[in-house]
């Protein structure tokens, strides 16, 4: 059954050091505020579906997202915002203002990251929203835009 | 006694995978350079006291702090600084200059983070200082300002 | 031999929670785009050689680098770039543009970080390139410039 108190290997494969992780790069073509990811990244104990990472094992997860922006400055300043969502709810955001001088320059690079430490249950979804997704640099720097999670602890 | 060489569960609950973690959000009202935190966050094997995270289990910790600033630009540039302190000593800092154009604009968002990997003993305190605490955005983005630690390894 | 299926302590010392880590600060004097590091930092299960961290145990590693820049603004904007290299190949970059107003100001602080989650084999090298290494602030903030890795999981 589910009990393995006598079986060493079974015990060692269980909880306190069970591992789950994901490391996905952003999809090449973005067309909406909810980002899509390349599902051919690293996925272990986590599923990818429709822009979501879907948790398979409950526990405390470290979640980190990093995005590389390339902004063609308009005449006004631009607020770049990265939102981390758990089950479609915004749990954490990072904002930075670029092009603040109000000058039309060739381009401005900006790197933005956000992390979260949270308990996630089975089937919890993790996703990322970016209003200004058009500024995410998927052409020059496609590998820089990543969403990563790893299970830190699945014991209470 | 302290020896549990024959007891599987006892061994498994011991060192190499003992876990400790914290994830606290900044207090709503800040009035000094040493930041205060909401003690109703995630605390496991770590205590919170007077603006400090207090370590309960010795080991190698990953410490990360992230702050969201909202600056009403004056006529000059502003240096935002985040200091991570271990036992009251500044161990690591992150600085960024905003409002560099010297123009009075409506507002400028800036996100700043800092991490540290360090051996911490029992009763070690972890805290954060910010000279320009008045710019930390605790109203629009209260959840973005966090201090987190987790024990990576408690073995030598 | 290599088999320890009957030996508890042997099993517990094995894989799923084998730990390796490094946390190195940048060298005081930098003279090329490939950064050098102070080898008297924290090194455990990882070697340092000629600007490279050299992996000793295969597995999934979390790699993070953070740099503090201090830029004396010229008449034009400056792109700061941090490259993470695995076996001399650029695996991840972070870019940010400073001095975008085009004004000669006294100085501008900028903090830049980059992380990576990747499977690394024995003897894999991890290094960092920065084109604008002259702007890395090694004098005022020597401790802010760090390269850190830690083994998350060495099981498949």
């Amino acid at each position: 059954g589910g009990n393995c108190s006598e079986d060493l290997l079974c015990i060692l494969k269980r909880a306190p050091f069970k591992k789950s992780w994901a490391y996905l790069q952003v999809a090449k073509h973005l067309n909406k505020t909810k980002l899509s990811w390349n599902k051919d990244g690293i996925l272990h104990g986590v599923r990818y579906q429709d822009g979501n990472l879907v948790i398979q094992f409950p526990g405390l997860y470290f979640i980190i997202c990093q995005l590389q922006f390339l902004v063609q400055c308009p005449n006004n300043s631009v607020d770049l915002k990265l939102e981390l969502l758990i089950n479609k709810h915004i749990k954490k955001q990072a904002l930075v203002t670029v092009c603040e001088s109000g000058m039309q320059t060739k381009h401005v690079y900006q790197n933005l990251s956000q992390f979260l430490l949270d308990y996630l249950q089975v089937n919890t979804t993790v996703s990322v929203n970016v209003d200004t997704f058009q500024y995410i640099d998927t052409s020059t720097f496609p590998l820089e835009n990543v969403l990563s999670v790893f299970l830190y602890s699945n014991s209470d | 006694g302290g020896n549990c060489s024959e007891d599987l569960l006892c061994i498994l609950k011991r060192a190499p995978f003992k876990k400790s973690w914290a994830y606290l959000q900044v207090a709503k009202h800040l009035n000094k350079t040493k930041l205060s935190w909401n003690k109703d966050g995630i605390l496991h094997g770590v205590r919170y006291q007077d603006g400090n995270l207090v370590i309960q289990f010795p080991g190698l910790y990953f410490i990360i702090c992230q702050l969201q600033f909202l600056v009403q630009c004056p006529n000059n540039s502003v240096d935002l600084k985040l200091e991570l302190l271990i036992n009251k000593h500044i161990k690591k800092q992150a600085l960024v200059t905003v409002c560099e154009s010297g123009m009075q604009t409506k507002h400028v968002y800036q996100n700043l983070s800092q991490f540290l990997l360090d051996y911490l003993q029992v009763n070690t305190t972890v805290s954060v200082n910010v000279d320009t605490f008045q710019y930390i955005d605790t109203s629009t983005f209260p959840l973005e300002n966090v201090l987190s630690v987790f024990l990576y390894s408690n073995s030598d | 031999g290599g088999n320890c299926s009957e030996d508890l302590l042997c099993i517990l010392k094995r894989a799923p929670f084998k730990k390796s880590w490094a946390y190195l600060q940048v060298a005081k004097h930098l003279n090329k785009t490939k950064l050098s590091w102070n080898k008297d930092g924290i090194l455990h299960g990882v070697r340092y050689q000629d600007g490279n961290l050299v992996i000793q145990f295969p597995g999934l590693y979390f790699i993070i680098c953070q740099l503090q820049f201090l830029v004396q603004c010229p008449n034009n904007s400056v792109d700061l770039k941090l490259e993470l290299l695995i076996n001399k190949h650029i695996k991840k970059q972070a870019l940010v543009t400073v001095c975008e107003s085009g004004m000669q100001t006294k100085h501008v602080y900028q903090n830049l970080s980059q992380f990576l989650l990747d499977y690394l084999q024995v003897n894999t090298t991890v290094s960092v390139n920065v084109d604008t290494f002259q702007y890395i602030d090694t004098s005022t903030f020597p401790l802010e410039n760090v390269l850190s890795v830690f083994l998350y999981s060495n099981s498949d």
Partner: antibody
């Protein structure tokens, strides 16, 4: 109660050698970073060098005037710190203090509040 | 190397006076500064660490302040037992340099 007791001082000729010891009690010595500080007659305090704990690699740092001549070592099994002084010069004449290093507070929660009474080294022909 | 410049080198004040000793570092040492008290023939004692934190057991008339390059040790109400030489020390980077010392006497 934390105690540091230095020994091994004495009179030695220029070019000679001497080994100082420091017996430590009341702290977990293996965790401690340890320093040597000296004070020449009528002068101020001068830091000589330090040794880190094994966790931090057990590495040593030295002041310029003694680098290459002095060696700091430790024996964690005996809770003892050593200072091997070679090629001694007249300007090395001083009281030598064994102390817990300031970085102990950053790393281990006890500060450099513990000094020994010192042992006198006289270098003279 | 970081130079620590302490001033004055000596001072004489009356019991009850407020005494201020300054220490300047040749470069930024954050708050990695300690103040020590040394009396002839006695063990040297720590007064303040991390620039402003009073060591336990040290009378509250002693206080430290400063960060970066400029630091101050203040004795709010000088007492006869405070006659001693006071040293500041940088422990931000090696070598862990001391200031030259300030000898405090009673008028």
């Amino acid at each position: 109660e934390v105690q540091l007791v230095e020994s091994g001082g004495g009179l030695v000729q220029p070019g000679g050698s001497l080994r100082l010891s420091c017996a430590v009690s009341g702290i977990t010595f293996s965790n401690a970073w340890m320093s040597w500080v000296r004070q020449a007659p009528g002068k101020g305090l001068e830091w000589v060098g330090r040794i880190k704990s094994k966790t931090y690699g057990g590495t040593t740092d030295y002041a310029a005037p003694v680098k290459g001549r002095f060696i700091i070592s430790r024996d964690d099994s005996k809770d003892t710190l050593y200072l091997q002084m070679n090629s001694l010069k007249t300007e090395d004449t001083a009281i030598y203090y064994c102390t817990t290093d300031p970085w102990n507070y950053v790393n281990y929660n006890y500060f450099m509040d513990v000094w020994g009474k010192g042992t006198t080294v006289t270098v003279s022909s | 190397d970081i130079q620590m410049t302490q001033s004055p080198s000596s001072l004489s004040a009356s019991v009850g006076d407020r005494v201020t000793i300054t220490c300047r570092a040749s470069q930024d040492i954050r708050n990695y500064l300690a103040w020590y008290q040394q009396k002839p023939g006695k063990i040297t004692h720590l007064l303040v660490y991390a620039a402003s934190t009073l060591q336990s057991g040290v009378p509250s008339r002693f206080s430290g302040s400063g960060s970066g390059t400029d630091f101050t040790l203040t004795i709010n109400s000088l007492q006869p037992e405070d006659v001693a030489t006071y040293y500041c020390q940088n422990y931000f980077s090696v070598p862990l340099t001391f200031g030259g010392g300030t000898k405090v006497e009673i008028k």
